[in-house]
Each structure stands twice: as C-alpha cells, then as structure tokens.
C-alpha cells in the first residue's frame, strides 16, 4: 500500500518570516523510526530545506544550523520554518520515510504553498 501524506495547500508566513504547518501521514504499519524531510520545489528543481530522523514518542531533532523546528504527536508532525524572505515563497513538500521496522515506506505530500511577504521598513520618525 502507498503511504498517504497530507499537508495544507496554502500557508502564509507571519511578519517575522516564520511559517508553520502540519504534516500528517497514514502509517501502514507501526513505525518506530521516522524521517521527515522538507523539500522546496521551484520550477522542476527540488532542494532539501531540512530533515530530521526521530524515534516515535521522541522529539524531532534538526541540525543546529537548521531553519526548521518541529514536534511530533502520533502520525502528525508540526513543522516550523524560520527566517523566510519573500524570495523563499514557493511550494514546500513534506516527505515521510518509515525507516524501521521493515517494510520501508515513503510518502510524499502534495506540497504547501508558503507565501512570504517582506515587512515594509519602518518610516523615519521626525
């Protein structure tokens, strides 16, 4: 069976350039080790934004220099991407891999279009 991954179609980043969305997967089995990857698709190019491998019931641990943070609850992962600018507007795909135990499954969401609007600079006050 294919693993279904659901994520919102559209999210608007806040004025500080932070966007959050939920990535939910329908696990065909009882996974204990899961890897979540956020990919950005621009035109036909796909690049990795961040990735974390976690044990079920434990916190997601992204690398120290990652722009992502997240928490997990059951088959849901709450992802937050920080430091976004207007040029980062695009489609962000959630990829979930059930690494252990066998069998391995991979699921890809349809993507979340994240819109980022750079804040207007504050006008000089007299």
């Amino acid at each position: 069976k294919a693993m279904h991954v659901a994520q919102p179609a559209v999210v608007l980043a806040n004025s500080r350039g932070t966007a959050s969305f939920v990535c939910e997967y329908a696990s065909p089995g009882k996974a204990t080790e899961v890897r979540v990857t956020v990919l950005r698709q621009a035109d036909s190019q796909v690049t990795e934004v961040c990735a974390a491998t976690y044990m079920m019931g434990n916190e997601l641990t992204f690398l120290d220099d990652s722009i992502c943070t997240g928490t997990s609850s059951g088959n849901q992962v709450n992802l937050t991407i920080q430091g976004l600018r207007a040029m980062d507007t695009g489609l962000y795909i959630c990829k979930v891999e059930l690494m252990y135990p066998p069998p391995y499954y991979m699921g890809i969401g349809n993507g979340t279009q994240i819109y980022v609007i750079d804040p207007e600079p504050c006008p000089d006050s007299d």
Epitope: K1, A2, M3, H4, P28, E33, R35, T37, L39, V46, T47, E48, A51, T53, I93, K95, M99, Y100, P102, P103, Y104, Y105, M106, G107, I108
Partner: antibody
C-alpha cells in the same frame, strides 16, 4: 556534477567473496539513501539492497539476504557491497544508484561486472 | 511484494511512430511512486519519468507518463532513432523496490 563510479568486480569462484565499492562525488553523500541494483546478462533489472542516510537501516532482496551486506562511509563518500557465498546466479552487472529527493533512482553508476564461475 | 508486469515484451515500430508501453501492478501503487527508465545496450539505466507523469531533467517532451492505481502507461509520441531501447517501470513507495521485466522497443 553527480558521479557514481563502481569498482571491485571480477571473476570469482562459487562460494567465495567479493567487495564492491561505489565512489560518489558532486553531491552531499550523507543526505541521500543509496541502492545496489543488478542485471544478469540479457535479463532485466533486479533491486538488491538499500541503505539509509546514516547506514543504520538496511534492506535486502530475499535472493541475497544473509549473504550480502551493504554499508557506507559518509566520510569517504563511498558505498560498499560485501558479497559472500557467491553463486552462479549472482553473475550480473552491479549498479549503485542514488535515491532522488522524490524517491526514484535519479543517478546510476556505469556498473561493474561480477562473474561467478568455477 | 508489488509485482510489475510490462506489456508488450517487444514493440516493433518505425521512427516517427507512436509507442505505447504498459505497466500493470499486482496491487495499488500511489501515482507519486511510479517511475520509468530507459536503458540502451552497454549503458546504465536513465530516469525518464517519476511520479507517474513528471519528466526528469533533460528528458524531451515526446516522453509522457500517465496512469494511477494499478495501470500506468509510458507514451513516446514520435519515435526518434535514439529512442530504440529497453524501458522499465519501477515502484519506489515501499520495500522491496521492484521493476517490471522490461519492454524492448525495436526498429521495424
């Protein structure tokens, strides 16, 4: 540019061992899962084995389980396949392949021929 | 294990003709997890189509993929001389990763 170069193939007697290597360059090796795929002479493609990003998770085809071992050295950007108790039916070209971000095998090496014969 | 069956085994066509290759899965394959590869003699396979219908980088638009569930199709709209090769479908959504047995497209 992405490059995968296999080595280590050759002629070996049944029951003996061989270790294949796949040198990767042009990408961040540790960010990708990897596979070995083989092709017997005149036959189709057969998936052999998979290894996860950090090397902790490995999967094998039933035909090689217990005889072949996949491993990787991320510091050397190299993938390995240790083949023990080789049989005539293991004769094939062995390809290493990279898993693309969205799952397909997006880059393949040129292959290395393993011939098991007495 | 998901078994992929390709048909026909061999397709004999002339340059300029349309080629239609079929891949049938023994159980449902999500459309995001079906790929097509081309292999020429003495060469490694080359990714053509992923996600059932997305063309890989550098693949000409005469190649197109379609289908969902258990039935998938690779279409080559107008065969060029360099398209005569063997084509494989593959599912990559779950282990074990499996390939079809291949369809050979030969010159008539």
């Amino acid at each position: 540019q992405v490059q995968l170069v296999e080595s280590g193939g050759g002629v070996v007697q049944p029951g003996r061992s061989l270790r294949l290597s796949c040198a990767a360059s042009g990408f961040t090796f540790s960010h990708y899962t990897m596979h070995w795929v083989r092709q017997a002479p005149g036959k189709g493609l057969e998936w052999v084995t998979f290894i996860s990003y950090d090397g902790n998770n490995k999967y094998y085809a039933d035909s090689v389980k217990g005889r072949f071992t996949i491993s990787r050295d991320n510091s050397k950007n190299t993938l390995y396949l240790q083949m023990n108790s080789l049989r005539a039916e293991d004769t094939a070209i062995y390809y290493c392949a990279r898993t693309g971000w969205l799952g397909p095998f997006d880059y393949w090496g040129q292959g290395t021929l393993v011939t098991v014969s007495s | 294990e998901i078994v992929l069956t390709q048909s026909p085994g061999t397709l004999s066509l002339s340059p300029g003709e349309r080629a239609t290759l079929s891949c049938r899965a023994s159980q449902e394959v999500g459309e995001s997890y079906l790929a097509w590869y081309q292999q020429k003699p003495g060469q490694a396979p080359r990714l053509l189509i992923y996600g059932a219908f997305s063309r890989a980088t550098g693949i000409p638009d005469r190649f197109s993929g379609s289908g969902s569930g258990t039935d998938f199709t690779l279409t080559i709209s107008r065969l060029e001389p360099e398209d005569f090769a063997v084509y494989y479908c593959q599912q990559y959504g779950s282990s074990p990763w499996t390939f079809g047995q291949g369809t050979k497209v030969e010159i008539k």
